[in-house]
Every structure is written in structure tokens, then in C-alpha cells.
């Protein structure tokens, strides 16, 4: 016999070595080679069948094709291995050029040997190795990333088999229409969206392979409850109030209750009832520079939601009524009215209106005036005053004045002081 060369002898080579020269193999109950043995193919003039190939693979069958050899012969013998290691032999008429191996196991490799026979002589075998298609399988349907209106699906499936997958989404109470999706057989995930919140669903997945529909697998999913009331936002903060806004599900509420309490709990809570369609409330008439807690809750048929909460500090009040007096060539007094809320300090910034480096002076929060010095004669100055408390600053209040330019202007400057800043004084 012939021995395969190399480290490992192939199953086909081993089969040839053991059987191709041996007489009387017998059928062996269908597991051996059909018919009688032969004298072998050494020195034979028989040509090997040409271009043996597998033209089609299926789960339980393989289709073989080949070309007729030139030399005359009587018949073909086709041998193929089983997963158990046994061989099956089939005798075929000499005009045969194709054959279908049937009754095979899915996803298994098969060795095929095809020889031409004449009398007791055999050609060298043509060889081919091929695997049957894997059986289409799907499993492990998993639901993840659940939101109020969507979820993700993932699953496992035999690769390269399925043309499409069909996903059916059915709500458990059968109140909604069944939704069906058809997606590519290459996919292993799907995002399902546009679902109602707080709803139980059954998900069915099936795969479509040529002429085969697999068994359907299923999973259950429940969309999350919609956050009925959320995103409490405070905006437009000013010394006397702020704007409260929130988000809520459409038609979920009959009314909203907005409660405003000062952080020190010194004042009575203020309550505002709004219709269920409103999403905003502008609050005015609050105290400047103090903390407030805002609570928003919704009512549905008398039931109250747990409130959304936010804490806020109203903006610092700005100084008022800037007055300039005692204006000289190089100095002036600026005074103002303090805001109602207590402040730590005032910052006064002044700069020539034509430009230049601003000067700054900070005074204690109890003061309501200061003297500006080292000014340039005959120059108009822009003055800005802000109140400060900790890191918080009020909106600025501004005004302008012009320093005296010479002796003639001193009388005018004194007149400004006498007339409470009605001359050369602008509120900006």
C-alpha cells in the first residue's frame, strides 16, 4: 500500500493504505465498502477521475461533481468517511458525473475518495474534503438597556446560515398591535424603540434560512416607568426672584404645586398652584441675597408626587442712586444707597471715558460713600459700583462725572455739591 508522507497520516491515506489493495472488503452491514475487493491500482493504466469537487453543501447532504477520465473503465467506486471513522462505499455507473451524499450529519467534515474501476483494476483515487452546513440554531435571547420607551436585544445564532431574522414584539395584555421587524441574518443585536412606558412585552425571535424556519425563541421585557416629573431648573436669577421650570409627562397631571421656603425657615412658605399644562413659574417679590428652597410636585386625581427640590440664592441687590459731589480737579466724592440685604463690601471702579487703566477701590459694606483721588483735571470718568458678599457680586450700577479743569470750574464743582449732583452728573 501507499503511506502518506508527513507527520500525520490523513484519514483518507490511512483508508487507502488499509483497504485499497485488500481483497474482499465486504459491505460490513453498510459501514464498509460495497462489493468485492480488487487487486489494487499499482501499475494500473486507469486514469484518475478528474476535477472532483463539492458543488453544493447542505446540512445533511453534499453534492459531488467530477469529469470522466479518458481511459476506458467499467464503473466508479465512491468511498466517504463517517464522523465515527467508518467508511461507506458506493458503486456508480461509468456515465455518472455527479452524486449526492445524503443522510449526513450537520456541521461535520467528510473525506471523499473516487476511483475508476475496470475488472479488478482501480485508478488512483481523486480526493476531496468537505463539511456539511451547520444546523441553523438560535439561542440566548437577552434583553438589556431598558428605558421607558426602548430596549436592546441580543442573541446567538449559527454563523453564515440565516438570511433574515424576524422579531415580533407583543404586549402581554394584547392591547397594542403586534410589531414585527425583519433584519439581516448577519445581525446579532437589535434596538427596539417607540414603546410605551411601564408595559410588559413578549419578544419572539425566529431565523429564516433557505427552506428552513428555526424554532422560535422568546424573552420578556418591561419598559421602565416614565419619570413623571423631572428636571427642575432655576433660571433668570435676580435680586427679587427667579424662574422655576420643570419637565413632566404630557397629560400626566391635573395641577402642580410650587412651594417656596426661605432656607432659614423664618418666613411662611409661599404656595402656588398651577394648571397641569404649565411648566414654568416666574417668582418675584422675594428678598435679595438669601437662600430659598423650591419644591415642585404634581397632582393626579388627588395623588401627590414626591416633590422635586432645588436650592437657590437670590441675586445680591445692586447699590442705587449714585451721586457725585465735592468734585475738584483731581478728586471727587461718590455716594450711593445700599441694597436692602446686608453686603460685605462695595467695589468702586472708575476709568476715564476715553479709555485707560481702570482704578479700583473697595470699601466696607457698611459705608455708602468714598473719595476718589488722583484724578486728571477736566476728564469725564465712568464710575461703576457693585455690592459683594462672599464670592457673590451684584449687578453694577454706573454713573459719570467730569473733574474740574481749572480755577473757573471750582465754583461750578461746589455748585454741584450744593445742588445734590444735578450738574455734570449722569445716571447710566
Amino acid at each position: 500500500g501507499s503511506t502518506a508522507i508527513g507527520m500525520k497520516e490523513t484519514a483518507a491515506a490511512k483508508f487507502e493504505r488499509q483497504h485499497m489493495d485488500s481483497p474482499d472488503l465486504g459491505t460490513g452491514g453498510g459501514s464498509g465498502i460495497e462489493g468485492r475487493g480488487s487487486m489494487g491500482y499499482r501499475g494500473s493504466e486507469l486514469d484518475t477521475p478528474k476535477d472532483l469537487q463539492v458543488s453544493e453543501t447542505a446540512e445533511t447532504s453534499l453534492t459531488l461533481l467530477w469529469k470522466t477520465p479518458l481511459a476506458k473503465f467499467d464503473r466508479y467506486r465512491l468511498n466517504y468517511s463517517l464522523p465515527t471513522g467508518q467508511w461507506v462505499g458506493v458503486q456508480l455507473p461509468r456515465n455518472t458525473t455527479s452524486y449526492v451524499l445524503r443522510g449526513l450529519e450537520p456541521g461535520q467534515e467528510y473525506n471523499v475518495l473516487l476511483t475508476a474501476e475496470k475488472g479488478r483494476h482501480k485508478s488512483k483515487p481523486a480526493r476531496v474534503k468537505a463539511s456539511t452546513a451547520k444546523e441553523p440554531e438560535i439561542g440566548n435571547l437577552n434583553v438589556s438597556d431598558i428605558t421607558p420607551e426602548s430596549f436592546n436585544l441580543s442573541w446567538m445564532a449559527t454563523d453564515g446560515i440565516f438570511e433574515t431574522f424576524t422579531i415580533e414584539i407583543i404586549d402581554s395584555n394584547r392591547l397594542l398591535e403586534t410589531v414585527e421587524y425583519n433584519i439581516s441574518g448577519a445581525e446579532r443585536t437589535a434596538h427596539i424603540s417607540g414603546l410605551p412606558p411601564s408595559t410588559d412585552f413578549i419578544v419572539y425571535l425566529s431565523g429564516l434560512a433557505p427552506s428552513i424556519r428555526t424554532k422560535t425563541i422568546s424573552a420578556t421585557a418591561t419598559t421602565e416607568a416614565l419619570p413623571l416629573l423631572e428636571n427642575l431648573t432655576i433660571s433668570d436669577i435676580n435680586p427679587y426672584g427667579f424662574t422655576v421650570s420643570w419637565m413632566a409627562s404630557e397629560n400626566a397631571f391635573d395641577s402642580f404645586l410650587v412651594t417656596v421656603v426661605d432656607s432659614g425657615k423664618l418666613l411662611d412658605p409661599q404656595e402656588f398652584t398651577l394648571s397641569g399644562t404649565q411648566r414654568k413659574l416666574e417668582l418675584r417679590g422675594l428678598i435679595t441675597g438669601i437662600g430659598y428652597e423650591v419644591m415642585v410636585s404634581g397632582f393626579t386625581q388627588g395623588h401627590q408626587t414626591k416633590p422635586l427640590r432645588a436650592e437657590i440664592v437670590t441675586a445680591m441687590g445692586s447699590p442705587k442712586e449714585v451721586i457725585f459731589s465735592d468734585i475738584t480737579e483731581n478728586s471727587a466724592t461718590v455716594s450711593w444707597r445700599a441694597p436692602t440685604a446686608q453686603v460685605e463690601s462695595f467695589r468702586i471702579t472708575y476709568v476715564p471715558i476715553t479709555g485707560g487703566t481702570p482704578s479700583m477701590v473697595t470699601v466696607d459694606g457698611t459705608k455708602t460713600q468714598t473719595r476718589l483721588v488722583k484724578l486728571i483735571p477736566g476728564v469725564e470718568y465712568l464710575v461703576s459700583i457693585i455690592a459683594m458678599k462672599g464670592f457673590e457680586e451684584s449687578e453694577p450700577v454706573s454713573g459719570s462725572f467730569t473733574t474740574a479743569s481749572g480755577l473757573n470750574d471750582i465754583f461750578e464743582a461746589q455748585k454741584i455739591e450744593w445742588h445734590e449732583g444735578t450738574h455734570h452728573h449722569h445716571h447710566h
Partner: antibody, heavy 118, light 107 residues
Framework: EVQLLESGGGLVQPGGSLRLSCAAS????????MSWVRQAPGKGLEWVSA????????YYADSVKGRFTISKDNSKNTLYLQMNSLRAEDTAVYYC???????????WGQGTLVTVSS | SSELTQDPAVSVALGQTVRVTCQGD??????ASWYQQKPGQAPVLVIY???NRPSGIPDRFSGSSSGNTASLTITGAQAEDEADYYC??????????FGGGTKLTVL
């Protein structure tokens, strides 16, 4: 004083119909949402249906959806529950209840017994 | 699920404090309401909102809430407090939901 008085209960065969009424007094009926709640013998409370003050919006438990209809006649200060295709499991005492804007089911009637049996 | 879960039965010695609890998804968003029902009578509202009592309800009744759990506390239980207690809330589809009820026995 708020008063709610149910009527219309009785014995009915499976598949039959019944109409319950709830006469209301002591409050502005048209301003308040109303509900029907039932209690099977020896069992807990089960909400059945609700209707808005104007009567424009209605809500139903899944167990009665498509079979029961809630309505109210604000001119007569009366709440109704039309019950069709009655089943044995609908046997219960049926209560009507008032809802205030900030207080749920704050007043209840004394109930009327509905028995569904052949 | 939109159901509310209650312990079927609770007992308390006369004058002692008892807590009846209620669990459910809707209680994450809404406060529970509590109803007292004595045999052969209609239910009576005893607590609603964060911790509000209708007029005529003794101040020994109080309510509290945390996460998906609501509690009704009776401080110094009296014989006349023996009754069934039902928690109640509402879900996102405006359906009222009730707990299965807790039978309170005063010993």
C-alpha cells in the same frame, strides 16, 4: 356635608348587564373627579374606573376595559357605571368615591352589592 | 408591576406603636394614601400626601415614605383602630392601585 349614595346593585346572570348609580350631594359635583372601587366578598379593594370632573376623560382597570362604561350627569349630580358582559368574578360591593384636587378618594359611599350568578 | 404589596396581618398591644408598610413601583413617584375599613363599613381616608390627615382623624395616625416603600404609623394604638388598612397610589396610566390590605389586630 358630602354624601354619596349608590344604587342599582342586585343579582344578575353571567353575560347580563347592570347599571349602577351614585347620587352625590354637599359639593359642586361638576368640579370633582369620581371613581368606582369594588370589593369582592372577603377580598381587598380593587379600583374599577374613574372620570374627570367635566366627564371628558375616563379611565378603566384592565379587568373591566371594554365591558364597563363610566359616565356622569353633572346636571343631576349623578355618577353611573354601565356594566355589560358580567362575569362571576365581577361579584362585589361597588363603592363610588369622590376625589379632590389634592386629596384622593376623600369621601366614599356605603356601597351596593352586585352578584353575578346563574 | 403596578401592584402594591402589604403584609396580610399585623398585631399590636394596646397603647403601643405599630407600623403598616406598603411597597410598589408607583411609590417611587407618588406618596401613598391610606384607608381604614372596619367590617361592614366603607373605607375611610386616614392619611394622604406627604403626611396629611383629613379632619376628624386622630393625630396618632401618621405617614412616611422612602423609596418604593410607604408606611402608616399608629402611635399608641387604641381598640377602635382594629381594622383593615389599605394603601393606595396611582400609576402612570392614571389607574388607581391598591395594596392587598393589612388586618390590624389590637391585643
Amino acid at each position: 356635608e358630602v354624601q354619596l349614595l349608590e344604587s342599582g346593585g342586585g343579582l344578575v346572570q353571567p353575560g347580563g348587564s347592570l347599571r349602577l348609580s351614585c347620587a352625590a350631594s354637599g359639593f359642586t359635583f361638576s368640579s370633582y373627579a369620581m371613581s368606582w372601587v369594588r370589593q369582592a366578598p372577603g377580598k381587598g379593594l380593587e379600583w374599577v374606573s374613574a372620570i374627570s370632573g367635566s366627564g371628558g376623560s375616563t379611565y378603566y382597570a384592565d379587568s373591566v376595559k371594554g365591558r364597563f362604561t363610566i359616565s356622569k350627569d353633572n346636571s343631576k349630580n349623578t355618577l353611573y357605571l354601565q356594566m355589560n358582559s358580567l362575569r362571576a368574578e365581577d361579584t362585589a360591593v361597588y363603592y363610588c368615591a369622590k376625589t379632590s384636587p389634592r386629596v384622593p378618594l376623600d369621601y366614599w359611599g356605603q356601597g351596593t352589592l352586585v352578584t353575578v350568578s346563574s | 408591576s403596578s401592584e402594591l404589596t402589604q403584609d396580610p396581618a399585623v398585631s399590636v398591644a394596646l397603647g403601643q406603636t405599630v407600623r403598616v408598610t406598603c411597597q410598589g413601583d408607583s411609590l417611587r413617584s407618588y406618596y401613598a394614601s391610606w384607608y381604614q375599613q372596619k367590617p361592614g363599613q366603607a373605607p375611610v381616608l386616614v392619611i394622604y400626601g406627604k403626611n396629611n390627615r383629613p379632619s376628624g382623624i386622630p393625630d396618632r395616625f401618621s405617614g412616611s415614605s422612602s423609596g418604593n416603600t410607604a408606611s402608616l404609623t399608629i402611635t399608641g394604638a387604641q381598640a377602635e383602630d382594629e381594622a383593615d388598612y389599605y394603601c393606595n397610589s396611582i400609576n402612570s396610566t392614571r389607574n388607581e392601585v391598591f395594596g392587598g390590605g393589612t388586618k390590624l389586630t389590637v391585643l
